[in-house]
C-alpha cells in the first residue's frame, strides 16, 4: 500500500480466483483514543472499532472510502484505490492501446519544436468518474524538472458503437537547451483512477524522436509564363525552432489528381520553393520534416492548382 | 428466528490456539456482515473481527495478524481461528449479526492459563 496523495491511498494486488488479498492497516488521524468506530463507504454497518484497524482488501467491494467517527462527529477518512496485477502484469483496463508505433502504445507525444515544450494524449472509452494526473521528468535516477500542465478532454469521435475520448496534456521542460544532444530521455507518467481502479502508464522519449513539425505557412502557387510549370513557395511554420539556419527542414512537394488512383508526382528539397507541373483539377500539397533527424513528416499544407 | 450456537472454546496454554465455530440459522447468513465480539470477566463487550458477505475481514488492534475469521456459506458456518493466545485473550466469546452484539448466542468461553 502507498500514498497517492493526502488520504488517498493504493493497495496493490495480485489478481485472481479466491487471491487472499492484502492486509491493510487504518489508522483514524485523530488524538482520541477510545470510543472510535469505522464504516466503509455509505453503508450504516459499522465495520469495527479502535484507532486502528486492520482490514482484509481483496476485491473492489473492499475499496472506497473508509471514515472513523466518534460519537456521531467524523473524525477523518481514507480512501482505498486498487491497483490491480494479474498474471504478473499491472492492468491496462482505463486506457486504450493506440497500437502506433507498435502494441501497447497508451501515451503517444509530439514536440512541434526543440524548445522542450511537448503534448501528449491518450485514448479511453470512459466517460465518468475519470481522473488523470501528469508527472514528468528528465531522467529518471537525478530527475531535472518538467512541468505538465492538467490533462483535458480534447475531443470526442463515435467509432462504431463507441464513443471514444481524447484527453491531452502539454508539458514544458524547466530549463530545456534546443541545440543540446540529449543524452537522458524524457520520462512521462500518467496516474489514472476509474471510481476505484488505479493505474499508471509510462511512456520514455527523446524530444528530437518525437519532433512533428507543423506543416509550411503560406504556400503559393505562380504560373509561369508560356508554360504548365509552376513555382510553388512556402514558408517555415512560425512555431518551428530558430534560427532556421541551425534548425533547418527539409521538404516535399507533391501534385496529387483528383483521384486517389492518379500518379503522385513528388519533389525532396531543402529549399522554400520548387518548379512542378500543375495538371488541371490537381493540388499541391507541402510537408515538412527535421532535415538532419528523420523524426515525423509534417501534415500536408495544399492549395488547388486551379 | 435468528439462532447463533457458538462452541470451541476451552482451557488453553499461553502460545496455544484454539478453533471456535458459530453455527447460524433463521436468516440469510451469506449476504450479512458477521460479527465476533468478547466480554472478558467484569468488562463490557469488545469488538474482535467482522466478516463482509465477500470474505473479506476486519480486525481489532489487540489481534495482530493472531486470528483469523472465515465462513463456510454452505455450513451457515463462522470460523474464528485463535492462534498465539495470551491470557489477556481470556473471556467469554459470541458471533453476532450486529456490531454492538445485540443479536448473539450464549458464547463460548475461552481461558488461556499455565
Known amino acids: 500500500i502507498w500514498e497517492l496523495k493526502k488520504d488517498v491511498y493504493v493497495v496493490e494486488l495480485d489478481w485472481y480466483p479466491d487471491a487472499p488479498g492484502e492486509m491493510v492497516v487504518l489508522t483514524c488521524d485523530t488524538p482520541e483514543e477510545d470510543g472510535i468506530t469505522w464504516t466503509l463507504d455509505q453503508s450504516s454497518e459499522v465495520l469495527g472499532s479502535g484507532k486502528t484497524l486492520t482490514i482484509q482488501v481483496k476485491e473492489f467491494g473492499d475499496a472506497g472510502q473508509y471514515t472513523c467517527h466518534k460519537g456521531g462527529e467524523v473524525l477523518s477518512h481514507s480512501l482505498l484505490l486498487l491497483h490491480k496485477k494479474e498474471d504478473g502484469i499491472w492492468s491496462t483496463d482505463i486506457l486504450k492501446d493506440q497500437k502506433e508505433p507498435k502494441n501497447k502504445t497508451f501515451l503517444r507525444c509530439e514536440a512541434k519544436n526543440y524548445s522542450g515544450r511537448f503534448t501528449c494524449w491518450w485514448l479511453t472509452t470512459i466517460s465518468t468518474d475519470l481522473t488523470f494526473s501528469v508527472k514528468s521528468s528528465r531522467g529518471s535516477s537525478d530527475p531535472q524538472g518538467v512541468t505538465c500542465g492538467a490533462a483535458t478532454l480534447s475531443a470526442e469521435r463515435v467509432r462504431g458503437d463507441n464513443k471514444e475520448y481524447e484527453y491531452s496534456v502539454e508539458c514544458q521542460e524547466d530549463s530545456a537547451c534546443p541545440a543540446a544532444e540529449e543524452s537522458l530521455p524524457i520520462e512521462v507518467m500518467v496516474d489514472a483512477v476509474h471510481k476505484l481502479k488505479y493505474e499508471n502508464y509510462t511512456s520514455s522519449f527523446f524530444i528530437r524522436d518525437i519532433i512533428k513539425p507543423d506543416p509550411p505557412k503560406n504556400l503559393q502557387l505562380k504560373p509561369l509564363k508560356n508554360s504548365r510549370q509552376v513555382e510553388v513557395s512556402w514558408e517555415y511554420p512560425d512555431t518551428w525552432s530558430t534560427p532556421h539556419s541551425y534548425f533547418s527542414l527539409t521538404f516535399c512537394v507533391q501534385v496529387q489528381g483528383k483521384s486517389k488512383r492518379e500518379k503522385k508526382d513528388r519533389v525532396f528539397t531543402d529549399k522554400t520553393s520548387a518548379t512542378v507541373i500543375c495538371r488541371k483539377n490537381a493540388s499541391i500539397s507541402v510537408r515538412a520534416q527535421d532535415r538532419y533527424y528523420s523524426s515525423s513528416w509534417s501534415e500536408w499544407a495544399s492549395v488547388p492548382c486551379s | 428466528e435468528v439462532q447463533l450456537v457458538e462452541s470451541g472454546g476451552g482451557l488453553v496454554q499461553p502460545g496455544g490456539s484454539l478453533r471456535l465455530s458459530c453455527a447460524a440459522s433463521?436468516?440469510?447468513?451469506?449476504?450479512?456482515?458477521m460479527y465476533w465480539v468478547r466480554q472478558a470477566p467484569g468488562k463490557g463487550l469488545e469488538w474482535v473481527s467482522t466478516?463482509?458477505?465477500?470474505?473479506?475481514?476486519a480486525y481489532a488492534d489487540f489481534v495482530k495478524g493472531r486470528f483469523t475469521f472465515s465462513k463456510d456459506n454452505a455450513k451457515n458456518t463462522l470460523y474464528l481461528q485463535m492462534n498465539s493466545l495470551k491470557p489477556e485473550d481470556t473471556a467469554l466469546y459470541y458471533c453476532?449479526?450486529?456490531?454492538?452484539?445485540?443479536?448473539r448466542g450464549q458464547g463460548t468461553q475461552v481461558t488461556v492459563s499455565s
Open positions: 466478516i463482509k458477505p465477500n470474505g473479506s475481514t
Open positions: 453476532s449479526t450486529d456490531y454492538a452484539g445485540t443479536v
Open positions: 433463521g436468516f440469510a447468513f451469506s449476504n450479512r456482515w
